[in-house]
């Protein structure tokens, strides 16, 4: 997990200032008001591995 201003969060995650860490964009389904979800809207999801 990366600090803001260094490297970005990995694909499928976004930085949360509230929690001070990268968070899973998948969790925005259950918690869409989370601060990091705005960043998820612009980022592509992690690909499925089928």
């Amino acid at each position: 997990e990366q600090a803001p201003g260094t490297a970005p969060c990995s694909r499928g995650s976004s930085w949360s200032a509230d929690l001070d860490k990268c968070m899973d964009c998948a969790s925005c389904r259950a918690r869409p008001k989370s601060d990091f979800c705005l960043g998820c809207a612009a980022a592509p999801p992690a690909p499925f591995r089928l």
Partner: antibody
Amino acid sequence: EVKLQQSGGGLVQPGGSMKLSCVASGFTFSYYWMNWVRQSPEQGLEWIAEIRLQSNDYPTHYAESVKGRFTISRDDSKNSVYLQMNNLRPEDTGIYYCACRYADYFDHWGQGTTLTVSS
Amino acid sequence: DTVLTQSPASLVVSLGQRATISCRASQSVSTSDYSYIHWYQQKPGQPPKFLIKYASNRDSGVPARFSGSGSGTDFTLNIHPVEEDDTAIYYCQHSWEIPPTFGAGTKLELQ
């Protein structure tokens, strides 16, 4: 380091009551949904209760098997979550774990505490 | 409620070989982007330990020997190569809805 320290448990008679406690450290407690999960040879791992956040007036959810008998609560000022269990039954016997999740997966678990309901 | 069916119930694997554990959901637990299945490892006398989230994403510190896959209703946990320390019971869990439920577990033993 994330830690969930549990207390409570022991032997109680059918129809009796017991309160479990769990104190959290090492993460931003007030942002996380707090849960109780129990484990028994008969039922395996069974989620039983969840309490969400102050911003939504602490909504709670319960498994059908405990609804009306168990009450989950939390005190964010003490980083603590509780499970009040009333009208206990023999089938409530098991290991009780507190666990946290932000939304989906239970990423941290307490050490577990054993409850035995028997006469 | 969404029921998760794990198979096999127990599995005996030789050191260095592959262990494959299946988890089947009674309804789809996937969106177009994510699958809401997670995997845990439990050793005797310990609480479950979180391994894999959203079907295929390892938690930090989990060795690359552990991998997850699947979508819809069918999911798989693979361990390869199996090491001695992997002896445990493995559980899947869904977070599609309330209640979140767990599979009955798969006990992995080494030959």
